[in-house]
């Protein structure tokens, strides 16, 4: 053999009970002591420090703290140094050293020692991770190292958590003993924070000890707070709130169209939108995620705004008889009333739609002109003007005529046409054609689609010639012999030479 001792490095006992510290020791066989003596010291192995003597086999002299409370259960002759401490109190918590006394110079304090912990609560052991929906085993362990008093275990606050199974007395690695009771159950998220208790009582005594553990149940997030759909006026401030219940707290993320707008590990997350624009209208998603799962919900943000200036697409130039289709579109929220006017006359209207199609079958020159597309909702009104140009062959209007006065003849050729025609005056009797380009004879002015060309002939009063007016554009030509009106009808005055 050699010098050595074996005892638990730590041992526990309930206050007021007792504790048996199992201890064995060995020494070189050749020392062959006639009698083996021993001493238990408290808190220090150095006799020089005069540590309290817990037990001494040679004498009955022990420190006052251990008077009547210490007894050797082991037989030192059999190298068993097991110590019994009775009616333990907190001040007895600490280190216990054994010193073998074999006579002669052979006193040996073993460096191996036992740390006594005086407890007053059962130890409830909850697995490091308790997940909702997954069966868990919770144990209640209490020291059972007192041969005189044996603990009995019962659970507190375990209603609905299953029936306890008592494992009984178990030996730990270093020779200490524990009483163990097990509780098997499947926790729910509602069990998070639940206080589970265990009670150790000692029959025929008033000793009773309780311990509690708060359940830390891990569970995936559920979004519990979320705006319903939100309507906001352009330029206003919008707050979107997302709150989730989970353990541990989730990573909350606000997203739109796959873009992360804001995220934080929190139970709730506010997304603040300052001065919202229509571009921010859309669906916002809140994603809540932790290691145990995820949840997501969406909220629609509707940004209300006045219509944008309408845009007009379609044919703005048409040939008489064609069908014209014009599309007026805008953007607004809510959708607007769209109306197309021409000269204050409503041609077409649509309610709560963002576009209006105007169809004009077989356009005539009367359809030519300025049109207005007006978009209106409760937040405002915008309008866009557009011109429709109807192209057609010349039409010689009835007010075309010639009139003589003294020595001058004036002929008016009034033509309606689009595009503008070329006008020529033909005098068949003289085999002469006068074009509008001949400015000394012809004066032209245009008003809208009507062109008035005036031919002035001097010295023709006595015998006014026949005058034919011909108007021509890419759609055709029209000729008219201009009727003469009597002198009584037209009065010409020519002043000057």
């Amino acid at each position: 053999g050699h010098w050595g001792a074996w005892m638990p490095s730590s041992i526990s006992a309930f206050e007021g009970t007792c504790v048996s510290i199992p201890c064995r020791f060995d020494f070189p066989d050749e020392l062959r002591p006639a009698v083996v003596h021993g001493v238990w010291y408290f808190n220090s192995p150095y006799p020089k420090n005069y540590p309290p003597v817990v037990f001494k086999s040679r004498t009955q002299v022990v420190h006052e703290s251990f008077q009547g409370r210490s007894r050797l259960l082991g037989d030192l002759g059999l190298r068993n140094c097991t110590l019994l401490l009775s009616n333990v109190s907190p001040e007895l918590g600490g280190k216990y050293y054994f010193r073998g006394d074999l006579g002669g110079y052979n006193q040996y304090t073993f460096s191996e020692h036992s740390v006594l912990d005086i407890v007053n609560t059962p130890n409830i052991v909850v697995p490091p991770e308790v997940v909702a929906g997954t069966e868990v085993e919770v144990s209640c362990m209490v020291p059972d190292n007192c041969p005189e008093l044996r603990p009995e275990l019962s659970w507190l606050g375990h209603e609905g958590l299953g029936e306890p199974a008592v494992l009984g007395r178990l030996r730990e690695d270093e020779g200490t003993w524990v009483q163990v009771s097990l509780l098997h159950f499947v926790p729910t998220r509602e069990a998070n924070g639940h206080r589970l208790g265990c009670q150790a009582s000692f029959p025929n005594t008033t000793l009773q000890f309780e311990g509690y553990a708060s359940m830390d149940v891990k569970y995936p997030p559920v979004i519990v707070e979320m705006n319903s759909s939100v309507e906001a006026i352009e330029g206003s401030h919008v707050s979107l709130l997302c709150g989730a219940d989970s353990n541990p707290p989730p990573l909350l993320t606000w997203m739109r169209d796959g873009t992360v707008l804001r995220e934080a590990v929190a139970e709730s997350l506010l997304l603040e939108l300052e001065e919202v624009t229509p571009a921010e209208d859309g669906v916002y998603a809140c994603l809540a995620e932790n290691a145990y799962g995820q949840d997501n919900r969406t909220v629609g943000l509707s940004v209300m705004y006045a219509p944008w200036k309408p845009t007009v697409n379609g044919t703005m130039v048409a040939v008489e008889g064609e069908t014209v289709s014009i599309l007026c579109s805008t953007q607004s929220n809510p959708d607007p009333i769209l109306t197309i006017f021409k000269e204050k006359q409503i041609l077409s209207t649509v309610i709560y739609e963002s576009e209006l199609q105007l169809e004009l079958p077989a356009v005539s020159p009367e359809d030519d002109g300025e049109y207005w597309c007006v978009a209106e909702n409760q937040y405002g009104q915008r309008a866009t003007a557009f011109n429709l140009s109807v192209e057609f062959a010349p039409v010689l209007l009835l007010e075309s005529h010639c009139a003589a006065a003294r020595d001058t003849v004036q002929c008016l050729c009034v033509v309606k046409s689009n595009p503008e025609p070329s006008v020529a005056f033909e005098l068949p009797s003289r085999n002469v054609t006068v074009n509008e380009s001949e400015r000394e004879f012809v004066y032209s002015e245009r008003s809208g689609l009507v062109l008035t060309s005036i031919l002035t002939l001097r010295g023709q009063a006595q015998a006014p010639p026949r005058v034919i007016c011909t108007a021509r554009n890419l759609y055709g030509a029209k000729s008219l012999e201009l009727p003469f009106q009597g002198a009584h009808r037209l009065m010409w005055a020519k002043i000057g030479p």
């Epitope: 010098w3 070189p28 050749e30 002591p33 006799p47 002669g104 110079y105 052979n106 006193q107 460096s111």
Partner: antibody
Framework: QVQLVQSGSELKKPGASVKVSCKAS????????MNWVRQAPGQGLEWMGW????????TYADDFTGRFVFSLDTSVSTAYLQISSLKAEDTAVYYC???????????????????WGQGTLVTVSS | DIVMTQSPDSLAVSLGERATINCKSS????????????LAWYQQKPGQPPKLLIY???TRESGVPDRFSGSGSGTDFTLTIINLHTEDVAVYYC????????FGQGTKLEIK
């Protein structure tokens, strides 16, 4: 040089007490243990026990428990043997003898007694 | 306890001759930890305290003449004095200090 000087002879009546002193010099007192050895007239040597001068811890041989007390006064490098309730059979020469101690950690090893006092004769007689 | 038995109880040797004293222990005094024999020899002259001669069974204490030597191991040990001098007349004790300390009963050495 090392010296252990013991107190002088004592004549005591049975039932009385006696205290024998042993004053050490010439070495560091607490580095050596102090032993007590008895030699009855015409008899051999009997080891009574020893006292650890560093810790003050006494160890008694099995035949010398109870009436025999070892003590120290390290301030004057002196060890004491006190015998109470003296009996006639306690008549003997009492020797103190030092022994080297090798300390290591919380333990030590004791070696042979190398220096002895001159002895103190205690006579117990009515 | 370990019992030490010396032989002979007394011994007469002529001056200049060799004296041999034996000592037997009831149990081995060889310590396994350091392989040393925890045995010593003392010389005691009348009216004087014992004087250390040999320790560790064979190591001579300083100042002791080399006429004195010790031998043996385990349970059997011998003290040898060669070239015996007049001043060697004394009682010799063997002593074990392994376990609870014990002495032999002594051997008285005289001049023949």
């Amino acid at each position: 040089q090392v010296q252990l000087v013991q107190s002088g002879s004592e004549l005591k009546k049975p039932g009385a007490s006696v205290k024998v002193s042993c004053k050490a010099s010439g070495y560091t007192f607490t580095n050596y243990g102090m032993n007590w050895v008895r030699q009855a007239p015409g008899q051999g040597l009997e080891w009574m026990g020893w006292i650890n001068t560093y810790t003050g811890e006494p160890t008694y041989a099995d035949d010398f428990t109870g009436r025999f007390v070892f003590s120290l006064d390290t301030s004057v490098s002196t060890a004491y043997l006190q015998i109470s309730s003296l009996k006639a059979e306690d008549t003997a020469v009492y020797y103190c003898a030092r022994n080297p101690i090798n300390y290591y950690g919380i333990n030590y090893e004791g070696y042979v007694m190398d220096y002895w006092g001159q002895g103190t004769l205690v006579t117990v007689s009515s | 306890d370990i019992v030490m038995t010396q032989s002979p109880d007394s011994l007469a040797v002529s001056l200049g001759e060799r004296a041999t004293i034996n000592c037997k222990s009831s149990h081995s005094v060889l310590y396994s930890s350091n392989q040393k024999n925890y045995l010593a020899w003392y010389q005691q002259k009348p009216g004087q305290p014992p004087k250390l001669l040999i320790y560790w069974a064979s190591t001579r204490e300083s100042g002791v003449p080399d006429r004195f030597s010790g031998s043996g191991s385990g349970t059997d040990f011998t003290l040898t004095i060669i070239n015996l001098h007049t001043e060697d007349v004394a009682v010799y004790y063997c002593h074990q200090y392994l376990s609870s300390l014990t002495f032999g009963q002594g051997t008285k050495l005289e001049i023949k």
